[in-house]
Interface confidence: medium
């Protein structure tokens, strides 16, 4: 199996109750706003064929894909939450920056790739539907990558 | 086929100590968190702690906050729970239970017949 | 104690439909999209039925549906049958990384 190196969060990122709130609320915000409740973007389909020991380079790839692609267009909507946690979310990316897979990653990224072709196809809503996941990222980062 | 086997319960006086085992087969048990649910006789369900993967997150229901710790060794495909200074309303049957996919360490697919603890003077 | 709020019992017919309600708070079900429903026959062990407010693991009939609205979840058994009857349970996951379970709902088939 690939050999992930560096990836792994300190525990005090997720012991902050403050930041932990907002992105709680950021979330809910965002989900009182999406339609389509049948595609869940952070799921079964995700994690499928990715051992644990893989799932924060996963993860990972979420993360700077949800921060690029929909965050960053994004930050003027749902605030006050987005101020605070967008920062919070980039400065855990930038602690990921050196976690890497020594090995094949292609069905990491395969599965990756059929998140963001869901987030692209579904255009605005797509985009409202993973900042309505950020609860379940955060709690995937968490479970992953301590 | 999924199996989780619950042991290490019995009888013990209040204030005492009991280590419930849950040994789990039938799938790679380091690609799931693993749970305790506990169900007083007749009464619901009720979860009393969860570990992620490999140990690093352990959470606690603020019933047992201080007194039970749980912990994994995925070397014996086992799950522990220490339980420290019981009282009479932690007699329960103890389940382990495992999530539903790799990923929902919140969602309880699969579960034990679960053991049971007495705490009683 | 339960921290989510469920009927102690409901009942119907055979073939009715029968709904079952959830309710929370805003840091539990009002939150979050992490409820599911357990199915516990007497002496056996619980039956997850529905995950993510509203799907079924493989397996599970599609008389069994849920939903959620603000802080109460709801579970519906449509075409009720004698097998049905059981307790449920629903649960959250909670932003304080916790689950709370409701005090579960006796289903009984007239």
């Known amino acids: 199996a690939p050999i992930s190196s560096h990836c792994r969060l300190d525990k005090s990122n997720f012991q902050q109750p403050y930041i932990t709130n907002r992105t709680f609320m950021l979330a809910k915000e965002a989900s009182l706003a999406d339609n389509n409740t049948d595609v869940r973007l952070i799921g079964e389909k995700l994690f499928h064929g990715v051992s644990m020991s893989e799932r924060c380079y996963l993860m990972k790839q979420v993360l700077n894909f949800t921060l690029e692609e929909v965050l960053f267009p994004q930050s003027d909507r749902f605030q006050p939450y987005m101020q605070e946690v967008v920062p919070f979310l980039a400065r855990l990316s930038n602690r990921l920056s050196t976690c890497h897979i020594e090995g094949d990653d292609l069905h990491i990224q395969r599965n990756v790739q059929k998140l963001k072709d869901t987030v692209k196809k579904l255009g605005e809503s797509g985009e409202i539907k993973a900042i309505g996941e950020l609860d379940l990222l955060f709690m995937s980062l968490r479970n992953a990558c301590i | 086929e999924v199996q989780l086997v619950e042991s290490g319960g019995g009888v013990v006086r209040p204030g005492g100590s009991l280590r419930l085992s849950c040994a789990a087969s039938g799938f790679t048990f380091d690609d799931y968190g693993m749970n305790w649910v506990r169900q007083a006789p007749g009464k619901g369900l009720e979860w009393v702690s969860g570990?992620?993967?490999?140990?690093?997150?352990?959470d606690y229901a603020a019933s047992v906050k201080g007194r039970f710790t749980i912990s994994r060794d995925n070397a014996k495909n086992s799950l522990y729970l220490q339980m420290n200074s019981l009282r009479a309303e932690d007699t329960a049957l103890y389940y382990c239970?495992?999530?539903?996919?790799?990923?929902?360490?919140?969602?309880?697919?699969?579960w034990g017949r679960g053991t049971l603890v007495t705490v009683s003077s | 104690q339960a921290v989510l709020t469920q009927p102690s019992s409901v009942s119907g017919s055979p073939g009715q439909s029968i709904t079952i309600s959830c309710t929370g708070a805003s840091g539990d079900v009002g939150a979050y999209n992490f409820v599911s429903w357990y199915q516990q026959h007497p002496g056996k062990t619980p039956k997850l039925i529905i995950y993510?407010?509203?799907k079924r693991p493989s397996g599970v009939s599609n008389r069994f549906s849920g939903s959620k609205s603000g802080n109460t979840a709801s579970l519906t058994i449509s075409g009720l049958q004698a097998e049905d009857e059981s307790d449920y349970y629903c649960?959250?996951?909670?932003?304080?990384?916790?689950?709370?379970f409701g005090g579960g709902t006796k289903v009984t088939v007239l």
């Open positions: 239970a495992r999530g539903w996919y790799s990923g929902s360490f919140y969602y309880f697919g699969y």
């Open positions: 570990v992620n993967w490999n140990g690093g997150t352990r």
């Open positions: 993510d407010v509203n």
């Open positions: 649960s959250s996951y909670t932003s304080t990384f916790s689950v709370v």
